[in-house]
């Protein structure tokens, strides 16, 4: 059977903007040379502010008549970018976002690129390759990921509040040790979600609590010492886990130390 392993390639462009390309060896379903050719759809999470490259099926230009990219974004008319090999012409219909372009000349590379991915790029992208014997399709459900900003503070006696602000999709917050917790979600018009978890610990031998925020862009753990006197200076310390230590919580200073990164948060 074909190998459907996912290949997510990450590089740096100008040492600043990460670029990712999701092009996997999709399963070919053209059995018995039926004219119902490969239709493959991929769900693809991509981080905001990166560059993204979307690929067509692996078919040589010599076999093609037309290459079309169909782009369906929320609240917008369907945009199509087409290349006709016979006349070597390209045509666009209803395409207004200048950040979505062919990677290069379509006769050299049929890939589509999105420069500096924004929340508005959430949507469905499909490459249609027209051959003399039928069409090959490659579709992407693009989900733009936004890293939430994480804060942790104590707001009253033995009660801590952990917030993951404006993430997409919503982050998940858990605590160690478990306390008496209430979690609320606030949805913003741009599609991001703020998650707020407030926990209380009645047991007095619990002196330090950890808030663990899980998100598709990476995980973050912050911890705080529960102080008995309200209004005293409190600190939240934390470290990343997993491959991506990318949460940059507001008012958190990053210090290099023997144990990795330590984050000090001062609540006034």
């Amino acid at each position: 059977q074909p190998n459907n392993s996912l290949m997510l390639q990450t590089s740096k462009e100008n040492h600043a903007l990460a670029s990712s390309s999701l092009c996997m060896d999709e399963k070919q379903i053209t059995q018995n040379y039926s004219k119902v050719l490969a239709e493959v759809n991929t769900s693809w999470p991509v981080k905001m502010a990166t560059n993204a490259v979307l690929c067509c099926p692996p078919i040589a230009l010599r076999n093609l008549i037309i290459i079309t990219w169909e782009i369906i974004l929320r609240g917008q008319p369907s945009c199509t970018k087409a290349y006709k090999k016979e006349t070597n012409e390209t045509k666009e219909t209803n395409c207004t976002d200048e950040r979505i372009t062919w990677v290069s000349r379509p006769d050299q590379n049929s890939d589509l690129q999105i420069r500096t991915v924004a929340i508005t790029h959430d949507g469905y992208y499909r490459c249609i390759m027209v051959t003399p014997d039928g069409n090959f399709h490659r579709g992407y459900h693009l989900q733009v990921l936004v890293t939430p900003e994480v804060t942790l503070f104590q707001n009253r006696n033995r009660t801590a509040v952990c917030k993951a602000v404006a993430g997409k999709p919503a982050a998940h917050i858990s605590w160690i040790p478990e306390g008496d917790c209430a979690t609320k979600q606030e949805y913003w018009s741009n599609g991001t979600v703020t998650v707020k978890s407030t926990c209380h610990w009645e047991v007095h031998n619990v002196s330090t609590v950890t808030c663990h925020v899980s998100h598709l862009t990476g995980n973050k753990s912050l911890y705080i010492e529960l102080l008995p006197v309200p209004g005293a200076k409190k600190s939240a310390k934390g470290g990343g886990s997993g491959l991506n230590d990318i949460f940059e919580a507001q008012k958190i200073e990053w210090h290099e130390g023997s144990g990795g990164h330590h984050h000090h948060h001062h609540h006034h």
């Epitope: 074909p2 092009c23 060896d25 040589a60 016979e86 014997d133």
Partner: antibody, heavy 119, light 110 residues
């Protein structure tokens, strides 16, 4: 069932020309690019060129430009490879192969035609 | 043009052996996430038979003891347990813009 049937073996003198045919069946002939490949005794497979019967586009390996001519007869679903100014080093088995769209791979090959160039 | 170098050019093995053949391209044959490298088996007097396409995809009807891997410039064909019918010559092949074959690896009985 897809089949590619090639013409029979040929013996030619140096300087002569040879024309090998490849009759396709079991699919729409004009829908797929046909490649021609040869294999001299004990040598690696060598690409000669391809023809796209859909639009008659052709492309040749630089080594064979000017000597090889690829044509097709759509009504007969047949591709042809003609090689001129034959020399002894052209002695080889010549294959036609249909390029499949996905991955540009060759699933279907002709049985091969042995062309011997000898004085 | 891209040159493909296969190694070894020949090898002797016994039934049941694990056999590995490598193919190195003079420049990357991977583009848009796909590696345009295929593997063929050829027996005397016969045309090549496709085994693996796009580096790692097993062609329909080919036994699962055959597998392919690699990307960029370095590729491998592996036969996990050599069978009597596997004694043949194996070729790697690249076909993105121009068609190129490796020099072949002849697998003989030890």
């Amino acid at each position: 069932e897809v089949q590619l049937v090639q013409s029979g073996a040929e013996v030619k003198k140096p300087g002569a020309s040879v024309k090998v045919s490849c009759k396709a069946s079991g699919y729409t002939f004009t829908s797929y690019v046909m490649f021609w490949v040869r294999q001299a005794p004990g040598q690696r497979l060598e690409w000669i060129g391809y023809i796209n019967p859909y639009n008659d586009d052709t492309k040749y390996n630089e080594k064979f430009k000017g000597r090889a001519t690829l044509t097709s007869d759509k009504s007969a679903s047949t591709a042809y490879m003609e090689l001129s100014s034959l020399r002894s080093e052209d002695t080889a088995v010549y294959y036609c192969a249909r390029e499949d769209y996905y991955g540009s791979r060759f699933v279907y090959w002709g049985q091969g035609t042995l062309v011997t160039v000898s004085s | 043009d891209i040159q493909l170098t296969q190694s070894p050019s020949s090898l002797s093995a016994s039934v049941g052996d694990r056999v590995t053949i490598t193919c190195r391209a003079s420049k990357s044959v991977s583009t848009s996430g796909y590696s345009y490298m295929h593997w063929y088996q050829q027996k005397p007097g016969k045309p090549p038979k496709l085994l693996i396409y796009l580096a790692s995809n097993l062609e329909s009807g080919v036994p699962s003891r055959f597998s392919g891997s690699g990307s960029g410039t370095d590729f491998t064909l592996t036969i996990s347990s050599l069978q009597p019918e596997d004694f043949a010559t194996y070729y790697c092949q690249h076909n993105r813009e121009l068609l190129t074959f490796g020099g072949g690896t002849k697998v003989e009985i030890k």
